[in-house]
């Protein structure tokens, strides 16, 4: 029989920015191949996605996900019920809203079937990792000569997000940023009707009911000025 | 583009160490997704996987059973290379060696050493 | 181990000819079963990986397929270059990784 020995190699410590435990294992080996790190992400609190890097397996290995709510009503454990897929490995978990509670703490379990004991545990905020859907419906208003007001709106909870939104003139190489608050509304005191204006807005959850990091996407981009003016001096949709 | 250099001796006494080593370029020997991996040739045994190295937060190697007692895969990052040592080598080492890179998630072999013909002979 | 048996161990064929190789697995491997040819002088060269994808670069006349544990290496129409030795391999259950004893593709 042509069995194989694993033998770990190297005294590097790691430390990770979120709670991880490893099972000791009982095998011949000094120590157990680490697993890899799950990152979750709660898309606009309709549904969440904790993926892991499954190249990171030296042999292909469908990992399993279970998950529970710390010290709350939801402390069951539960069962991934919706595997995500890459090269037909389990490189993923997609929950619905139902199964998400922003407020409690997450801990999710990924765990190696071929070797039980090889497991690791990640506490998790949801609050924090929280990110919205773009910005939608993008309208400016002239409220003077020269004064021009951006809206927009967004799929959530208005208070609970912060925005940045750029703008730049086909006369700039870069974007010009102004932070705004839950108000979704900026106004550009000092226009050049002489140039053409694009304005693009991102959303975060941020800071009054989580503290994300990760900001949306950028919202299709709204145009105004020389080529656009003549149509409407007053109110422009939105250009994709 | 990822290309693995393979060098050293091609004829070793009886007895002695066999000593290879496998330079890479175009990806690092840290890589977390890559395992490299030392496989030899010869008529009587076909192609042979020995054995591999890779960096998971911390270094592993695994060994074939078969040379387990004789063999050490080593990785250097300070020269982005990895080596193969076979101690106390009889003729029937003399093979081709070579390296090669797999990575998930398919896990294959893309990238090969050129192989380097290694007699044991006196 | 995973073992894996390639029959046949060589085949004659002529230029033009449709040439099938298989490969089976001493237990099922999924689709992780990956085929190479090798010219002498020359390191394995990676044609089908996952049991059926062709390699980027890797004529069409190549296929390959099955799943669990009996495998096809089918050339359609043999080319002169193709004359060669092939060989499979599982990345399934690893270490060891492990490969077929290779078949040898010669000019009849």
């Known amino acids: 029989l042509n069995t194989t020995i694993l033998t770990p190699n190297g005294n590097e410590d790691t430390t990770a920015d979120f709670f991880l435990t490893t099972m000791p294992t009982d095998s011949l080996s000094v120590s157990t191949l680490p697993l890899p790190e799950v990152q979750c992400f709660v898309f606009n609190v309709e549904y969440m996605n904790c993926t892991w890097n499954s190249s990171s397996e030296p042999q292909p290995t469908n990992l399993t996900l279970h998950y529970w709510y710390k010290n709350s009503d939801n402390d069951k454990v539960q069962k991934c019920s919706h595997y995500l897929f890459s090269e037909e490995i389990t490189s993923g978990c997609q929950l619905q809203k139902k199964e998400i509670h922003l407020y409690q703490t997450f801990v999710v379990q990924l765990q190696d079937p071929r070797e039980p004991r090889r497991q690791a545990t990640q506490m998790l905020k949801l609050q924090n990792l929280v990110i919205p859907w773009a910005p939608e419906n993008l309208t400016l208003h002239k409220l003077s000569e020269s004064q021009l007001e951006l809206n927009w709106n967004n799929r959530f909870l208005n208070h609970c997000l912060e925005h940045l939104v750029q703008y730049r003139t086909d006369w700039d190489h870069s974007w010009t940023e102004q932070s705004v608050d839950y108000r979704h509304k900026f106004s550009l005191p000092s226009v050049d009707g002489q140039k053409r204006y694009t304005f693009r807005v991102r959303s975060r959850f941020n800071p009054l009911c989580g503290s994300a990091q990760h900001w949306s996407e950028w919202s299709h981009p709204i145009h105004w000025g020389s080529n656009t003016s003549k149509e409407n001096p007053f109110l422009f949709a939105l250009e994709a | 583009q990822v290309q693995l250099q393979q060098s050293g001796p091609g004829l070793v006494k009886p007895s002695q160490t066999l000593s290879l080593t496998c330079d890479i370029s175009?990806?690092?020997?840290?890589?977390?997704?890559?395992?490299w991996n030392w496989i030899r040739q010869s008529p009587s045994r076909g192609l042979e996987w020995l054995g591999r190295t890779y960096y998971r937060s911390k270094w592993y190697k695994d060994y074939a059973v078969s040379v387990k007692s004789r063999i050490t895969i080593n990785p250097d990052t300070s020269k982005n290379q990895f080596s193969l040592q076979v101690n106390s080598v009889t003729p029937e080492d003399t093979a081709v060696y070579y390296c090669?890179?797999?990575?998930?998630?398919?896990?294959?072999?893309?990238?090969w050493g050129q192989g380097t013909l290694v007699t044991v002979s006196s | 181990d995973i073992q894996m048996t390639q029959s046949p161990s060589s085949l004659s064929a002529s230029v033009g000819d449709r040439v099938t190789i298989t490969c089976r697995a001493s237990q099922s491997i999924s689709s992780y079963l990956n085929w190479y040819q090798q010219k002498p002088g020359k390191a394995p060269k990676l044609l089908i990986y996952a049991a059926s994808s062709l390699q980027s670069g890797v004529p069409s006349r190549f296929s390959g397929s099955g799943s669990g544990t009996d495998f096809t290496l089918t050339i359609s129409s043999l080319q002169p270059e193709d004359f060669a030795t092939y060989y499979c391999q599982q990345s399934y259950s690893t270490p060891p990784i492990t490969f077929g004893q290779g078949t040898r593709l010669e000019i009849k």
């Open positions: 090669a890179r797999m990575t998930g998630p398919r896990y294959y072999f893309e990238y």
């Open positions: 175009g990806d690092s020997v840290s890589s977390n997704i890559a395992t």
